[in-house]
């Protein structure tokens, strides 16, 4: 039996009482709220320890947050036949700590995927290739959200994190077609080198709120269809030459860069002069420095070569601690 | 290229068990199911069920859900089914199929179906 | 389950002419996403079955294209447009939509 369930959908929602018999396919699985309608299947805040086996295959966007998932093995979501219609996929606040290889294999339209607000101690490399081979058949995804999934440091693997979510990106040349990433606020102190190269479609990229201090061994360049760029709230202290020619390069970008902590010294001279020249920064204007003490507050646009000046280093013998 | 192998017979006695194997190669066994079918002599195709061996879940047929039991090993990238409580009505061909996403020159991403077959092990249930 | 009833179940017919084999559903197989999981089968003596046709009227690589499938709901057909000798044995529809899956009773196609 199926009850009405409130919801802001305009297409009613069907909850699903658990029965004895095995569901029809087009039946809602226990747990859950579905409307056919909306293409649309609802199991949240439900302490789910596994993804229901028994989903529509009409699905097309599938809830499944506020869970208690832990792991997502391979073959997830593999279905006979497959939930070929599957776009959107959101899995964010589901306690998984482990998203294994091959977990989104046989969702041949999944074009969104959310993982946020999961603690990911381990995140597989071939999570969205779905195989070790070289190169992979091209993975659907457009849109992948991966804010916030660093665990706690007690949880952490040996390798470094940052390494582990890129080694997931760049598996395989799977996410060639991916549009939109977000990784924000996930405490990454660095880019992987290579991860940007292999994903030449990106249009949007959200690094905010991580803490980022240098980007001089990052290669924006042929990320050719970049929109925005979000750096907000990292540790940014100075964009060097190469990054900032690599940035107004790019035909459409727009830049974010509030909130970091920059150092108005000498090394700084170079950022200001193309701060005033340039159209890529949004909200160029409330840049303000950090750093030296002195400079607390004063706003990047305003400085001249005048105000950026470095202290002389003192020879050992003269330096005091 | 895919190739999935099967012994070619088996001969066992009445109430006992069978396990019979169905080896592949050339292809992500992992990414697959294994799909099992029965054949009579001189009769149709019966679904037994299918296993994902990414994740060990199986689907049964009613019919056979207490006669089949799908387990995989994926270090040797080998399906298995095991049979039990044998009677004359399990005398069969028993073949293996591979189910999945077919790779033709028209891209569809909803077109899965069983693409490749072993050739079948014959069982004899016998005294 | 879905009763899956192919006729005729013998198909005498002569090199070169035209081949047509109907398959009927108990029961609707196009699934809630509109995708039909009908799919065609020969099985030549001594063989296992091979894939010919998949969902409903397309046709699996290296299948040549005298083969044709048609059909929608519970109404199906697979013409063979020019028989040829390597097309004889035994035909069978399937649906892949609602578990379990099931066969056609198979129709075996012969020499006249």
């Known amino acids: 039996t199926s009850s009405a369930s409130s919801s802001s959908s305009s297409a009613p929602f069907l909850a699903s009482a658990a029965s004895a018999q095995p569901p029809l396919p087009d039946q809602c699985p226990a747990l859950c709220e579905c409307s056919e309608a909306a293409r649309t299947v609802k199991c949240v805040n439900r302490n789910l320890t596994e993804v229901p086996t028994d989903l529509p295959l009409y699905v097309r966007n599938l809830f499944l947050t506020g869970n208690q998932l832990a792991v997502l093995p391979a073959g997830a979501f593999a279905r006979r036949p497959p939930l070929a219609e599957l776009a959107a996929l959101n899995l964010s606040g589901s306690r998984l700590d482990e998203v294994r290889g091959g977990a989104f294999e046989h969702l041949p339209s999944l074009r969104q995927l959310d993982l946020s607000h999961n603690p990911l101690a381990y995140l597989s490399p071939f999570a969205f290739s779905g195989s070790n081979a070289s190169i992979s058949a091209p993975s659907p995804l457009v849109e992948l959200i991966l804010n916030h999934i660093v665990p706690p440091d007690d949880k952490r693997q040996n390798r470094s994190f940052e390494g582990m979510v890129a080694a997931a990106l760049v598996a395989g040349r799977a996410l060639q077609g991916l549009h939109l990433l977000e990784l924000a606020s996930n405490h990454f102190l660095y880019l992987p080198r290579d991860v940007l190269a292999q994903l030449p479609s990106l249009r949007y990229l959200d690094l905010s709120n991580n803490s980022l201090v240098s980007l001089t061994y990052v290669s924006f360049r042929n990320l050719t269809h970049l929109e925005s760029l979000h750096l907000e709230d990292n540790a940014l202290k100075v964009l060097h030459n190469g990054t900032l020619a690599e940035l107004q390069g790019l035909p459409h970008v727009r830049v974010f860069l509030d909130n970091n902590p920059w150092v108005c010294d000498c090394h700084m001279a170079d950022m200001v002069t193309w701060l005033k020249q340039t159209g890529v920064v949004q909200g160029k204007d409330r840049l303000t420095c950090a750093f030296p003490e002195k400079m607390r507050n004063r706003v990047l646009l305003e400085l001249n070569s005048a105000d950026l000046d470095c202290d002389p280093i003192l020879p050992p013998s003269l330096q005091t601690s | 290229q895919v190739q999935l192998q099967q012994p070619g017979a088996e001969l066992v006695k009445p109430g006992a068990s069978v396990k019979m194997s169905c080896k592949a190669s050339?292809?992500?066994?992992?990414s697959y199911w294994i799909t099992w079918v029965k054949q009579r002599p001189g009769q149709g195709l019966e679904w037994?069920?299918?296993?994902?061996?990414?994740?060990?879940?199986?689907n049964y047929n009613e019919k056979f859900k207490s006669k089949a039991t799908l387990t995989v090993d994926t270090s040797s990238s080998t399906a298995y089914m095991q049979l039990s409580s044998l009677t004359s009505e399990d005398s069969a061909v028993y073949n293996c199929?591979?189910?999945?996403?077919?790779?033709?020159?028209?891209?569809?991403?909803?077109?899965?179906?069983?693409?490749?077959w072993g050739q079948g092990t014959s069982v004899t249930v016998s005294s | 389950d879905v009763l899956m009833t192919q006729t005729p179940l013998s198909l005498p017919v002569s090199l070169g002419d035209q081949a047509s084999i109907s398959c009927r559903s108990s029961?609707?197989?196009?699934?809630?996403?509109?995708?039909?999981?009908l799919e065609w089968y020969l099985q030549k003596p001594g063989q296992s079955p091979k894939l010919l046709i998949y969902?409903?009227?397309n046709r699996f690589s290296g299948v040549p294209d005298r083969f044709s499938g048609s059909g929608s709901g519970t109404d199906f057909t697979l013409k063979i447009s020019r028989v040829e000798a390597e097309d004889l044995g035994v035909y069978y529809c399937?649906?892949?939509?609602?578990?379990?899956?099931?066969f056609g009773s198979g129709t075996k196609l012969e020499i006249k």
């Open positions: 037994i069920g299918d296993i994902y061996p990414g994740s060990g879940r199986a």
């Open positions: 050339g292809y992500t066994f992992t």
């Open positions: 029961q609707s197989i196009v699934y809630s996403n509109g995708n039909t999981y």
């Open positions: 969902k409903v009227s």
């Open positions: 399937f649906q892949g939509s609602h578990v379990p899956f099931t």
């Open positions: 199929a591979r189910y999945g996403p077919l790779f033709t020159t028209v891209v569809d991403p909803n077109s899965y179906a069983m693409d490749y």
